[in-house]
């Protein structure tokens, strides 16, 4: 057959649908690959052809559009299942062509089963609600196009296994679920079951999403650098390892990029001719506030390195902050030899052993100094 622009398998569109429920799948050509829509293509005399490859098979085969009750049908650029079966799983291809033009793309469709509490291998969208923020809503997702606006479906909402009724702060309102005030206890999976009639049959759509309660913008602050701080001095002798942690707290901010970085003498560490490594760790609170720690490490510090300026910087959508670490070269402590006199050491008279300086403590550092 003649050449066809083959966009391959579009794995970005890993479509998952529930068994025994309707599914409408738009041909991805018009959404992601071509610059014109289906109507334009149809007007130009192009035909949309569908075929598929079953799971664990290599053979492409036509889709059977003559099944009882039109279980699978095509409408414009949409492939309809009313409803799906488990063995509809496979790779589906839509091809747009006429005698002079051809373009096609494949995509995987997975029909999945759910358990009695709506758990399944389905990847769930996450909806973030601000903690103690006032009324917020989630909407039953991906139900557009399944029934006309003249049809009034029934919608039943669940949290986990349980139908939502008599919840203090969560109220079902048709396609929406309203949270009068969101708390950490509202974290979880929420499912809407939409029931609608069509051509003398009743269909159900099940949609689950994860609600995550996060920090409120009302409480958001610019980044806070906990370390380095004014209480810790990094005193080192040349040849020792210098470790300076930069620990920064970031309030949760929707779509904010949190950044932490070090500068040495005003330059990025990569631009300085010294052997520096930086290790980062990130932790999150229950409301997704973030703590980032970047540890700057110089294995064998030189006296030159100990004269440099080490500054930790942090930035979020709320602002930018910086804090310099106090780094010093350690001055070796004088070693005292005390002659014991006055009869105490008549026989031992001057053992010559060094005695630790009681002012400096056993390890010759100030209490708040850091090694």
């Amino acid at each position: 057959s003649e050449r066809c622009d083959d966009w391959g398998l579009d794995t970005m569109r890993q479509i998952q649908v529930f068994e025994d429920e309707p599914a409408r799948i738009k041909c991805p050509l018009f959404e992601h690959f071509l610059k014109f829509n289906y109507s334009t293509a149809h007007s130009a005399g192009l035909t949309l052809i569908w075929y598929w490859t079953r799971q664990d098979r290599d053979l492409e085969e036509p889709i059977n559009f003559r099944l009882p009750e039109n279980r699978i049908s095509k409408e414009k650029d949409v492939l309809w299942f009313r409803p799906t079966l488990l063995n509809d799983t496979g790779n589906y291809t839509c091809m747009l062509r006429n005698t002079t033009y051809c373009s096609k793309v494949a995509f995987p469709l997975e029909v999945v089963q759910k358990d009695s509490c709506f758990n399944s291998p389905m990847k769930l969208p996450v909806h973030k609600l601000y903690i103690e923020y006032g009324i917020q809503r989630i909407t039953c997702p991906n139900v557009d196009g399944y029934f006309p606006s003249s049809v009034k479906p029934t919608i039943t909402w669940y949290m986990g296994c349980y139908k939502i009724q008599n919840f203090n702060n969560v109220i079902p309102e048709g396609m929406n679920l309203s949270f009068l005030i969101a708390f950490i206890s509202n974290n979880g999976n929420y499912t809407c079951v939409v029931t609608y009639p069509e051509n003398g049959r009743t269909f159900h759509l099940t949609r689950t999403l994860t609600v995550k309660v996060v920090g409120s913008p009302k409480n958001a602050v610019p980044p806070v650098i906990h370390s380095p701080n004014d209480h810790v001095v990094y005193e080192k002798e040349p040849g020792e390892e210098l470790l300076i942690p930069c620990t920064v707290y970031f309030s949760f901010l929707m779509d904010s990029r949190n950044e932490v970085w070090w500068t040495i003498d005003g330059k990025k560490p990569d631009d300085i001719p010294i052997d520096v490594t930086i290790n980062e760790s990130i932790s999150h609170s229950r409301t997704e506030d973030e703590t980032r720690t970047q540890i700057l490490s110089i294995k064998k510090v030189t006296s030159e390195d100990l004269k440099r300026s080490y500054v930790c910087h942090a930035r979020s959508a709320k602002g930018e902050v910086a804090k310099a670490a106090t780094v010093k070269q350690k001055v070796p402590a004088p070693r005292y030899t005390v002659e014991l006199a006055c009869g105490f050491g008549a026989t031992g008279g001057g053992s010559g052993k060094p005695i630790p300086n009681p002012l400096l403590g056993l390890d010759s550092t100030h209490h708040h100094h850091h090694h």
């Epitope: 068994e19 025994d20 358990d115």
Partner: antibody
Framework: QVQLQQSGPELVKSGASVRISCKAS????????MNWVKQRPGKGLEWIGR????????NYNGKFKDKATLTADKSSSTAFMQLSSLTSEDSAVYFC???????????WGQGTTLTVSS | NIVMTQTPKFLPVAAEDRVIITCKAS??????VAWYQQKPGQSPKLLMY???NRYTGVPDRFTGSGSGTDFTFTISSVQVEDLAVYFC?????????FGAGTKLELK
């Protein structure tokens, strides 16, 4: 196209047990709840409990907790209800009925008549 | 358990009569009430769910209404084939419970 086919009538002795079956076809058996309902003349309808064949999860009406045991076999798309320690009070028509998570019953079996004799 | 009190028990009707059956829940069940029709020797058939939603294939002479504790099922113009027993059921919470039934019989 959805069909629930129940086993035939049963005549059993008091104190014995019985197992009634309900074979489903025309839909994904694993993905809907199967309920059991008791009907005695002049006593209306009583919900016994339900099972989700996909994972075997069950909910029972407390009144029937020690009387009925619900099971399901996914490979044959069949739900079962075992009734134990039978008495004349258990003489009734038993229906299986499907629900899609929503607690109302869109398809019913034809019913199985159980007669308990002393 | 939620008790569903259905009235009347018996309802004598003539063809094309308007029929009203009521069901009262012992506590608030929102709008979660279903109605079934059962003919002699047959299994029940779903007519309405969520109080006012007609199940597919059910003629539009059947309507339902109500919320909270009081529910009404109406047949606007009774046909001979409507002679049957009608049950209400709350599908609000477990255990699911039914009304005692209303038998439509010819006058």
């Amino acid at each position: 196209q959805v069909q629930l086919q129940q086993s035939g009538p049963e005549l059993v002795k008091s104190g014995a047990s019985v197992r009634i079956s309900c074979k489903a076809s025309g839909y994904a058996f694993s993905g809907s709840w199967m309920n059991w309902v008791k009907q005695r003349p002049g006593k209306g309808l009583e919900w016994i409990g339900r099972i989700y064949p996909g994972d075997g999860n069950t909910n029972y009406n407390g009144k029937f907790k020690d009387k009925a045991t619900l099971t399901a076999d996914k490979s044959s798309s069949t739900a079962f209800m075992q009734l134990s320690s039978l008495t004349s009070e258990d003489s009734a028509v038993y229906f299986c009925a499907r629900d899609y998570y929503l607690f109302y019953f869109d398809y019913w079996g034809q019913g199985t008549t159980l007669t308990v004799s002393s | 358990n939620i008790v569903m009190t259905q009235t009347p028990k018996f309802l004598p009707v003539a063809a094309e009569d308007r029929v009203i059956i009521t069901c009262k829940a012992s506590q608030d069940v929102s709008n979660e009430v279903a109605w079934y029709q059962q003919k002699p020797g047959q299994s029940p058939k779903l007519l309405m769910y969520y109080a006012s939603n007609r199940y597919t294939g059910v003629p539009d002479r059947f309507t339902g209404s109500g919320s909270g504790t009081d529910f009404t099922f109406t047949i606007s113009s009774v046909q001979v084939e409507d002679l049957a027993v009608y049950f209400c059921q709350q599908h609000y919470s477990s255990p699911l419970t039914f009304g005692a039934g209303t038998k439509l019989e010819l006058k």
